[in-house]
Interface confidence: low
């Protein structure tokens, strides 16, 4: 979390942003928050990104105005315009790219003052991993596959029963590279799995956390994943 | 197969407002952007604007703001126009055409729709 | 705004023979992207206009490998060689790396 503040004391607003990671293709939110005005066309939100020689984003008189914009975020960004008037200055930012990383400024002017607050975003691609018994085998396996991720993440396998024990030596990972050569696909093995156990494939690289579990019994088979982002916090 | 579809012409009197349509068919409405182009009589092609199907998002060459407002109805898949305060300088071919955000060149056009203003 | 400037006006040119239009750009037109959105359309008359190539020098499905097209920073080129009836009309260069997007004037390619 990142409070920031105007810079005349009586004539400062709080301004708070979260560090947050966009993932690839899809949209994104910088999230940002000040104290309230009571009249929309008093409240003046900038977004901007250092290095960016153009706005990232303006908002001012109860629309956008987007003359002063970047090329890069050309068409990509929106405020949540009914929010705005309750102090959500977050912005909304369309069909992330590997480029978008680096650190915002979200800058807010309204008749209390001014503040403004910075926030680092990263970029990066992220999946759920989803693990199957991989029937197709010679031997008890078991397959994990997450189709979407960037930076290359790590990939570790972990088991309830044998908890602490290192699987690296029975299991395979591989890294496929999507048709958009930036993202990559993620399959991993886990060979010679014992039954009434459950089993979790972990994959993380710098900007998520991601779990598949599967608990293998003679008569059912039990899935379960989530996802969490790291990093995730405000200024 | 993926068409875009105008009509052919509107006649309209100085100072009033047409609200021109595209339709759109082939293909998912919402992930594509469509744009404007001008064609005046003899003349070259002028770029408008464009919005976004899926949440309406538009975004306008200044020279055209004021003059044109693009709207577009998801559930007939079209895409509008309107022009204001006509003037004989809005005489021209009105085209529409789609553009992938990320490709970005734009792959299908409409046929145009003739705009004449006159009293 | 990205003014695009081609030349010549008009090219009269022979059946079979070869030709080349020039389009300039007033800046140089590539994106913070990296991309350079440079592409030629074909306008033939009464028709509304056909993409040729895109992004400098890709070719559209299904247009003849007789059109490319070269260049970088702000000069770029479109070639047709063995130059045939149906290629006749005015090509426009157009650039969509900076707003507002902007279309070059228009080479009418004409028989000699």
């Known amino acids: 979390l990142i409070i920031g503040f105007g810079i005349s004391g009586r004539h400062s607003i709080t301004v708070t942003t979260v560090a947050s990671a966009g993932n690839i293709g899809e949209d994104g939110i910088l999230s940002c928050t000040f104290e309230p005005d009571i009249k929309l066309s008093d409240i003046v939100i900038q977004w901007l990104k250092e290095g960016v020689l153009g706005l990232v984003h303006e908002f001012k008189e109860g629309k956008d105005e987007l003359s002063e914009q970047d090329e890069m975020f050309r068409g990509r960004t929106a405020v949540f315009a009914d929010q705005v008037i309750v102090g959500n200055a977050s912005l909304r930012l369309k069909n992330v790219q590997l480029t978008d990383a680096g650190t915002y400024k979200c800058y807010i002017i309204t008749s209390k003052g001014k503040g403004n607050a910075n926030l680092e975003y990263k970029t990066g691609a992220f999946s759920m991993p989803e693990v199957n018994v991989d029937y197709n085998a010679s031997s008890e396996t078991l397959r994990c596959e997450a189709p979407r991720w960037f930076p290359q993440p790590t990939v570790v396998w972990a088991s309830q029963v044998d908890q602490g024990a290192n699987f690296s030596e029975v299991s395979n990972t591989s890294f496929e590279l999507n048709s958009e050569n930036v993202t990559m696909k993620v399959v991993s093995v886990l060979y010679n799995v014992t039954i009434n156990n459950t089993y979790s494939c972990m994959i993380e690289n710098d900007i998520a956390k991601a779990t598949g579990d599967i608990k293998v019994t003679e008569s059912e088979i039990k899935r379960r994943s989530h996802l969490q982002l790291l990093n995730s916090k405000a200024s | 197969q993926v068409q875009l579809q105008q009509p052919g012409a509107e006649l309209v009197k100085p100072g009033a407002s047409v609200k021109l349509s595209c339709k759109a068919s082939g293909y998912t409405f919402i992930s594509y952007w469509m744009h404007w182009v001008k064609q005046r009589p003899g003349q070259g092609l002028e770029w408008i604007g464009e919005i976004d199907p899926s949440d309406s998002y538009t975004y306008y060459n200044q020279k055209f703001k004021g003059k044109a407002t693009l709207t577009v109805d998801k559930s007939s898949s079209t895409a509008y126009m309107q022009l204001s305060s006509l003037t004989s300088e809005d005489s021209a071919v009105y085209y529409c055409?789609?553009?992938?955000?990320?490709?970005?060149?734009?792959?299908?056009w409409g046929a145009g729709t003739t705009v004449t203003v006159s009293s | 705004d990205v003014l695009m400037t081609q030349t010549p006006l008009s090219l009269p040119v022979s059946l079979g023979g070869q030709a080349s239009i020039s389009c300039r750009s007033s800046?140089?037109?590539?994106?913070?992207?990296?991309?350079?959105?440079l592409e030629w359309y074909l306008q033939k008359p009464g028709q509304s206009p056909k993409l040729l190539i895109y992004?400098?020098?890709n070719r559209f499905s299904g247009v003849p490998d007789r059109f490319s097209g070269s260049g970088s920073g702000t000069d770029f080129t479109l070639k047709i060689s063995r130059v045939e009836a149906e290629d006749l009309g005015v090509y426009y260069c157009f650039q969509g790396s900076h707003v507002p997007w902007t279309f070059g004037g228009g080479t009418k390619l004409e028989i000699k």
């Open positions: 800046q140089i037109i590539v994106h913070s992207n990296g991309n350079t959105y």
């Open positions: 992004k400098v020098s």
């Open positions: 055409a789609r553009r992938k955000t990320w490709d970005w060149y734009f792959d299908v």
